[in-house]
Structures are given as C-alpha cells and as structure tokens.
C-alpha cells in the first residue's frame, strides 16, 4: 500500500502546521481569518477572561477522549458466571424483603475459584432480568458492608415497559473487594429511591428470581428462570505474571515519548505559536498550544514468522488491531478553548480534539 | 511519508487475515493453536453455551468503543456562562433552604440569547464550588419541574476535603428542555441523599454563594465569590443551517460503506471463517465473524489551496485531526466472545476490539 522513505521531520512539522491552519478555520467555519480592524484596543474584557478560564478549568478536569486502554485490555478475558444464592438459603432470613428492597447474595468462593487474584479482574457486572414494569421506577443498588450496613453504589431510572429486559450494573470495584477479603457470602440490595421528603416509595419493579410461584410452575420456573448473576471477565491466572514482565506495552504518551529516543510510533512534541508559526494575530488567547503529532513506523508483523513467540509479544504494541497496514495515529486527544473577535464581539469557543496526548498503531 | 500504488484488494485481505491469525493467538497468549486431542465428543455443554450467550448478549447491549462523534462535534462550540440568580431574589422565598437542600435558580432568557435553538446546544454543565468538607457526603441533584415537583437528575459521592473544589454536573438534557420551553426562571435543587430507612440526612456540604456573611466581608464575597453557574457550549446560530447542508460528514460505517462505491477511506466487508480462512477447528463458537477492515485514501488537504471555501468543507471528512499524513483507521470496534478448549476444559473468553464497525481518517 505504501513504500517507506526516510522521514523529513521538518517537512512533517510544516505539513502538520499547515493542516492545523486549515483545521482551526474549518472548525470555526471561517473561509479566512477574521479581520482585526474593529477590535477595541486594550486587554480582553474581564468577563471574557473569566469565561475563558472556566472553559480551561473544565478541560483540565476531564479529558475529551477516553483514556488509552491499559495493556491488560488487549488480552483475552475469561468469562465466568456466578448465579445468585437461591432464595431459600438461610442468609436471606436476616434480611426480610421489604416493600422497598430486595436482597441478592453470592457465594464468593465460586468467584475466587475463577478469579484467584483481585488484580486479574477486568470487569464485573451484576445482571438482573426485570419483568414488565407499569410505572417509571427509580432504583438504587447498595453493597453489603461490614456490620450489616449498606453502601450506596449506583442508581438507575427504569422506564415503563411491557417486555422483560436485562439490567446490568458495573460492580467491578465491589467484586475486586470481595476477592481481596475473606468472606464467604456477599450481597447486594436493590431499593426504591427515597427522597428526604417522601417516604412511601415502594419497589414496583419485579426482578426474575423473586416471584412467588406455586406447584409445578415453581419447578419449571426454577429450571428455566434466569436469576440474578454476576458476570466476571478476568485475565486467566496463568497469564497474570506476564502482565508485569518486561514485554508490557508502553503507553505512547507524552510522558514516555518526549523523554525517549523511540523510533517507532510515538507522540512527537510540537508547539504552535499562533503569531510565529501561522502569522495570526486574531487569536487573543492562548498565544499558542502544544498540538503535538504522531510519527513513527508500525511494523506489519508477518504471523508466519518462525520466531513466533517473539512475534506475538510484538502484536500488542505494533499491530493490536490486526490491520493490513498499521498506521501511527492519535489515541488520546484534548480540546482547546480560544478567544477571538468577530467584528467588535469577543467570542470564547472550544475546539475539539486539538491536542495530541498519545498515539497508537491502528 | 508514503507513495501510493494501486491497491491490490486481495493482498490487503490476505494481510488482514494473516494479521488476525496472529492477533487472536497473541490475545490468548498462545504460541500455537491448542491441540484438539482431548476435546470430548458431542456438542458444547449447556452451561458453557449459556455463558457464551450471556457474553454475547452483553456485547449486543453496549459497544466497547465510544460512538463516532456526530458531525456537529467537529465544529467549534461557543461558550457561555450564566450565573445563578442572586439569592435575595424573590424566587427563593418560595423555596426555603432546608437542612437537606439548597436551591439554585437561573434566568433562562440569558441562556436563550446565547443559544436560540435547543438543537444547537452541545453540552451544558452546572458548576458549583464546594467549600471544604469534613465528612463524606452523598448528594443528589434535582431539576425543578412543573407544579413545583422535582425530578431526580444525578448524584455524587463527595469525599472529605480540606480545599475547595469545583463540582460539575452534566445538565445538557435539562438545559435543552429549558430552551424549548417558554419559562423565565428555572432551577435546580441539591439535596442530601436519603435512604428509605434513615431520615436524618443533613446536607453537610457548603456551596459557595450560599454562605451567611456580614458587613464588608459580604460585599467582598459578592464581588469575588464564584457562585454556581451553568456553562453552555453550543454551535453558533449562524452555523446551524450548515449542519443540515449537503456537505455534511458521513459516518464511514457499515451502513454507508457496504452500500456505496466510496473510493476514499471506508470500512470494507471481510468475513473470517475460522475453518476456511485460517484452517482452524479449535474455536468452537462462533464459526466465524465479520472482522472487516479500513481502506481508502485520506487526501492531505493543502490549506493554501486557492479554492479555499471548498477545501475547508473537506477537512471534517478527510483530515479532521489535521495530521501531516492522514490515515484510514478503525473508529468504532466491537469485541468478540469465543469458546475453545484447553485440554478437556472449555473456556469462554472475550477478545476486545475485534470487529471493525466504522473507520475514520486520523
């Protein structure tokens, strides 16, 4: 698809700068830089600076793109399902189902057998089959804590529905705790949400596995009913030690790339000074920004290579997506707020995906 | 950086298939396919199939990668800040601050001036500066609804802290409602979380803008205090009509690409049959999967091109990240659960990022 040449770093930087020139105008839907002829003299109005700073603060607190996946996410996860302890178990006697709560207990030894170390756990979900629901219901999930107290985990607003539907709650942190503690039985509570004013909230939602059934129906239901369960995804124990080995994949981010001599795909430093690099005076804040860019080969790995075990270890770094022609591209990106004038009016606008924080072979 | 040749589609497919061979083994950390010598005859055990189906269901309900950003996300957002209506306004008289709630009201005409149409709103946040906090506090945010009722929006578990900190709540949907309704004043309530059992929950957290201050301190506080505000990001009104124009960016996904003759970057169809394409019998479920792949040029756009307005419209499609050498790579990916045997033991494992759903120039 392509033939490699020696990379002219200066040409790449020039092309990136020219591309940014077009990108900014394109994002603002401007055919040309706005004229500065009407801009009032003096500093930016205080209110505009306050707004710009608010936007900058917002950016500082959250990355626009998801974090790069940790190395463990590349590898296959073994899937395990642990069903809820049957409701006739004595553990349920201590926790009478009230009008606003139902309780679900799980045998942690089953989980521990599948996931011997907490660090191996990648994701755990509590899955409940909710039956048809006549009214909107706001439910909360709690985790059983020591001395019979309950710790709030999350909530869900359930829309009315005529058909059953699986609900899934992310309980990764909780299951990780269970695995690191010694307990045998651990539990969840699903409750109606109560506000401090109204106290009469009843749990309207029926969860499969708790219905009252009689006679033959009961045994059929038991056989076929899809009771609450925990679905766990974990790295198999035998692969765990390799996670900490020298072969682990690096994050191709600014921390690593700016301080290394990496020749392969990496994020490269590039500061754009609006005035010097683009000849622009019309962006009043900031004066420039760290745009950065991705550069470096992503060698295609021939899986028929005889040194196969070595080759496999390289996949994660150089071709995790099994592309026919892997390419070094941005992974984590961040937005850039700017202040500029249109006529006499100062504007604060946020441009998405402007700063390259890390790269990946894709 | 690269010189283009005519693309040999069959070679690309072969390279993709070979890459997948290595990718799957690499994800499973296997140096070679597992032997099938000990696999018991007959169909897969029911429990294993049930587990495989659970995993498949989970995948159906959620994509591993974020959704491709809508076209509007590419363009700059104008940022506006609307401060809370001052607490001496008569609106607050109807809502006495209780021990478990504080109220915040906003003038929607200010918002409507900045964002004339609800569809233009991209994101809105309610931002509150919380002062130091001695104990953990679980708070809930409510939206004022018609007839003085309150609708639950979200909650936050606040950790104890010695320093002030901005809290941010996503209120995009709420502000969109405000913009489409005719109201003048709209509001939020921040309350302590109450469970159905305990009734004594007091709001311990101090939010800047509600403290009782006297004398000179009060006027200083008023001037410098950072009161609650709504931060709105929206497409400028004058750019709105262009959103619906013929030039809009296509999602380079299976829906579009499989039914078009697009020569540029697009997702291309590729079904991998484990037995036929890879010569593998060891994966028991599924028999194959739609791996797909990305292919097609992402023309580098010279921003100095004279036909500039046409060029700018192409940026969003061909080089949204302003790369020096844009490349056609996967955007949305999905996982693949598989069933295979290790010795006599069946395993259900999930492989991340195996199915290419859409592509992008990056």
């Amino acid at each position: 698809l392509s033939t490699c040449k020696t990379i002219d770093m200066e040409l790449v930087k020039r092309k990136r700068i020219e591309a940014i020139r077009g990108q900014i105008l394109s994002k603002l839907r401007l055919a040309s830089p706005p004229s500065q002829g009407e801009v009032p003299p003096g500093p930016l109005p205080e209110a505009v600076l306050a707004l710009y700073n608010s936007t900058r603060d917002r950016v500082a607190g959250e990355s626009a793109e998801p974090e790069p996946e940790p190395e463990a996410d590349y590898y296959a996860k073994e899937v395990t399902r642990v069903l809820m302890v049957e409701t006739h178990n004595e553990i349920y006697d201590k926790f009478k189902q009230s009008t606003h709560s139902i309780y679900m207990f799980f045998n942690t030894s089953e989980l521990r057998e599948a996931v011997p170390e907490p660090v191996l756990l990648s994701r755990a979900e509590l899955r409940l089959l909710r039956l048809k629901l006549k009214v909107e219901q706001h439910v909360e999930l709690y985790q059983k804590y020591s001395n019979n107290s309950w710790r709030y985990l999350s909530n869900r607003l359930l829309a009315p529905s005529d058909s059953p539907e699986w609900l899934s709650f992310d309980v990764t942190g909780v299951v990780r705790q269970w695995l690191s503690r010694g307990g045998e039985i651990e539990g969840f509570r699903l409750s109606a949400h109560c506000s401090c004013d109204s106290r009469d909230n009843t749990l309207q939602v029926d969860i499969n596995g708790f219905e009252q059934q009689r006679g033959d129906m009961q045994s059929i239901a038991k056989k076929h009913r899809r009771v609450p369960y925990v679905l766990a995804m974990a790295l198999p124990a035998e692969r765990a030690n390799e996670l900490h080995s020298a072969r682990r994949r690096r994050d191709l981010d600014t921390d690593y790339c700016f301080s290394s001599t990496e020749k392969n795909c990496c994020v490269r430093q590039l500061y754009i000074d609006f005035r010097k690099d683009l000849g622009w005076k019309w962006i009043h804040e900031p004066k420039g920004y760290h745009a950065n860019f991705c550069l470096g080969p992503c060698p295609y790995i021939w899986s028929l290579d005889t040194q196969y075990s070595k080759v496999l270890a390289l996949y994660n770094q150089h071709n995790p997506g099994a592309s026919a022609a892997p390419c070094c591209v941005p992974q984590a990106l961040e937005p850039l707020p700017i202040v500029y004038y249109v006529g006499r009016k100062p504007k604060v606008e946020q441009l998405s995906n402007m700063i390259v924080r890390s790269c990946k072979c894709s | 950086l690269s010189t283009c040749k005519t693309i040999d589609m069959e070679l690309v497919k072969r390279k993709r298939i070979e890459a997948i061979r290595g990718q799957i083994l690499s994800k499973l950390r296997l140096a070679s396919p597992p032997s099938q010598g000990e696999v018991p005859p007959g169909p897969l055990p029911e429990a294993v199939l049930a587990l495989y189906n659970s995993t498949r269901d989970r995948v159906a309900g959620e994509s591993a990668e974020p959704e491709p950003e809508p076209e509007a996300d590419y363009y700059a957002k104008e940022v506006t800040r609307v401060l809370m209506v001052e607490t001496h306004n008569e609106i607050y008289d109807k809502f006495k601050q209780s021990t478990h709630s504080i109220y915040m009201f906003f003038n929607t005409s200010e918002l409507r001036e900045a964002v004339p149409e609800p569809v233009l709103l991209s994101r809105a946040e309610l931002r509150l500066l919380r002062l130091k906090l001695k104990v953990e506090q679980h708070v809930e945010l409510y939206q004022k609804y018609s007839n003085n009722s309150w609708r639950y929006l979200s909650n936050r578990l606040l950790a104890p802290s010695d320093s002030p900190e901005w809290l941010s709540f996503d209120v995009t949907g709420v502000v969109r409602q405000w913009l489409s309704r005719g109201g003048e004043i709209e509001g939020f309530r921040l309350s302590a979380h109450c469970s159905c059992d305990s009734r004594d929950n007091t709001l311990q957290v101090d939010i800047n803008g509600f403290e009782q201050q006297r004398g000179d301190m009060q006027s200083i506080a008023k001037k410098h205090r950072r009161v609650p505000y709504v931060l709105a990001m929206a497409l400028p009104a004058e750019r709105a009509n262009e959103l619906h124009s013929a030039r809009r960016r296509r999602d380079l996904d299976t829906d579009y690409c499989f039914s078009s003759t697009e020569k540029n970057c697009c997702v291309r169809q590729l079904y991998i049959d484990f037995r036929k394409d890879l010569g593998w019998k060891w994966i028991h479920e599924p028999k194959g999967y739609h791996a797909n792949f990305c292919l097609g040029p992402c023309p580098y756009i010279w921003s100095l091109d004279t036909q500039y307005s046409k060029v700018l419209a192409l940026y969003n499609q061909h080089n949204p990240g302003a790369s020096a050498a844009p490349c056609c790579v996967p955007q949305a990916l999905e996982p693949l659960p598989i069933v295979y045997y290790v010795g006599r033991k069946p395993k259900v494992e999930q492989l991340s990022n195996m199915i290419v759903r859409s592509c992008k120039c990056s």
């Epitope: 401007l30 006499r344 | 004279t306």
Partner: antibody, heavy 120, light 107 residues
C-alpha cells in the same frame, strides 16, 4: 443566489438630502454586516461605512469623510439597507454601491450601483 | 488611514498573456488584502480575498500572492472577459481603503 439591488439615485441640489435603498435577497440578512461604497466618476472606490449584524448589535461605523452627514440603517424584516444622505455637496456625486461585508475584511457581493449627481 | 497604492493605472496586454498587477500598502496589513474586478458597465465582483483565496465561481487563471506590504494579482492566459479595472483593498484596519485601480486593455 445572493442579490443586492440599489435604488433611489438621482439629481439633488447642494445642501439637499436623499435616501438610497438596497434590497437584499438570497441570504440571511441579519447574519451579515452591510456596507456602502461609492465611486466618483473616473476615480477609485471609497468605503463609506457599514452597519453591523445581529450578534454585533446592528451598530454603525463611518469613514471620516461622511461622518455626521450620512446615516446607515436597516430594516431587517424587509431585508433592506438604507443610506440617508444630508447636506449633500458636489463632491458626493458618485455611483453608490451596497455590498455585503464579511468578517474577513472583504466585500463578497455587490449591487449594480445607483448614481447620485449633486449639482445646482 | 492605510494608503493603498496601485502604481500602474493602466496596462495593455494581448489575449493569452500572463500579467501581474501590484498593490502596496503603507503599513503591514497581515495578508488582509482583497482584489475586485470592475467591468466597464460598472459591475463589481470579488475575485480574491485574504491575499490568495479565490472567491467561489472565480476562474483558476486568477491568483494572488504577497505578504507584509506588497501584494500582487496574476492573470494567466488572459481572456476577453478579463477586460476590466482591478482594485485592491485592505481589510486589516478601519477605515477599509482601496487602491486607485489598474485598468486592463487589450493591445
């Protein structure tokens, strides 16, 4: 298609007044600054002033040569631009163009012009 | 005010020729330089904005270049339809000002 059509030109005595109109179509009138430019016979073009768009509050800006005598206004409901000219002088004789102004510092569409002659 | 000077007030050329019209500003105008064409019937059209960007519908035989204070308009492969007067205009600083114009005639 963007279209600008001027009208109202004619012969006026020195010290007199006249109002020129410019009917706009084919674009969202309130989104744009609108400008007047004139050209005396055989001479260069001269920018007279503009009226800003809605986001900029429809405020006006004039060149020193006409400030105080000429007034630019707009009727947004009818998409019409006006130039009210008072205390006219012989040197105001020219072809008057209305033009759509963009924030990039240029006039992207022009009318065909209307001629004013100031003479006794 | 910024003065715009077009030193050549008239220019004679043959059909098919390549010719350049220049314009100088009295101070740096940061590329905010635009070119207009005025036909003999008085019709005015924008050709180029921001030094080198072609307005929609303008043939690609027109091109612009320059920076700082010196700018030029080039017409390659001159056609009969190009017979007109060409004005430059700065959009950097109010008041906007125009050059004196360059009248193009056929030899």
């Amino acid at each position: 298609e963007v279209k600008l059509v001027e009208s109202g030109g004619g012969l006026v005595q020195p010290g007199g007044s006249l109002s020129l109109s410019c009917a706009a179509s084919g674009f969202t009138f309130t989104d744009y600054y609108m400008s007047w430019v004139r050209q005396p016979p055989g001479k260069a073009l001269e920018w007279l002033g503009f009226i800003r768009n809605k986001p900029n509050g429809y405020t006006t800006e004039y060149s020193a040569s006409v400030k105080g005598r000429f007034t630019i206004s707009r009727d947004n409901s009818q998409s019409i631009l006006y130039l009210q000219m008072n205390v006219l002088r012989a040197e105001d004789s020219a072809t008057y163009y209305c033009a759509r102004y963009t924030g990039g510092g240029y006039f992207d569409y022009w009318g065909q012009g209307t001629t004013l002659t100031v003479s006794s | 005010d910024i003065q715009m000077t077009q030193t050549t007030s008239s220019l004679s050329a043959s059909l098919g020729d390549r010719l350049t019209i220049s314009c100088r500003a009295s101070q740096d105008i940061s590329n905010y330089l635009n070119w207009y064409q005025q036909k003999p019937d008085g019709t005015v059209k924008l050709l180029i904005y921001y030094t080198s960007r072609l307005h929609s519908g303008v043939p690609s035989r027109f091109s612009g270049s320059g920076s700082g204070t010196d700018y030029s308009l080039t017409i390659s492969n001159l056609e009969q339809a190009d017979i007109a007067t060409y004005f430059c205009q700065q959009g950097d600083t109010l008041p906007w000002t125009f050059g004196g114009g360059t009248k193009l005639e056929i030899k």
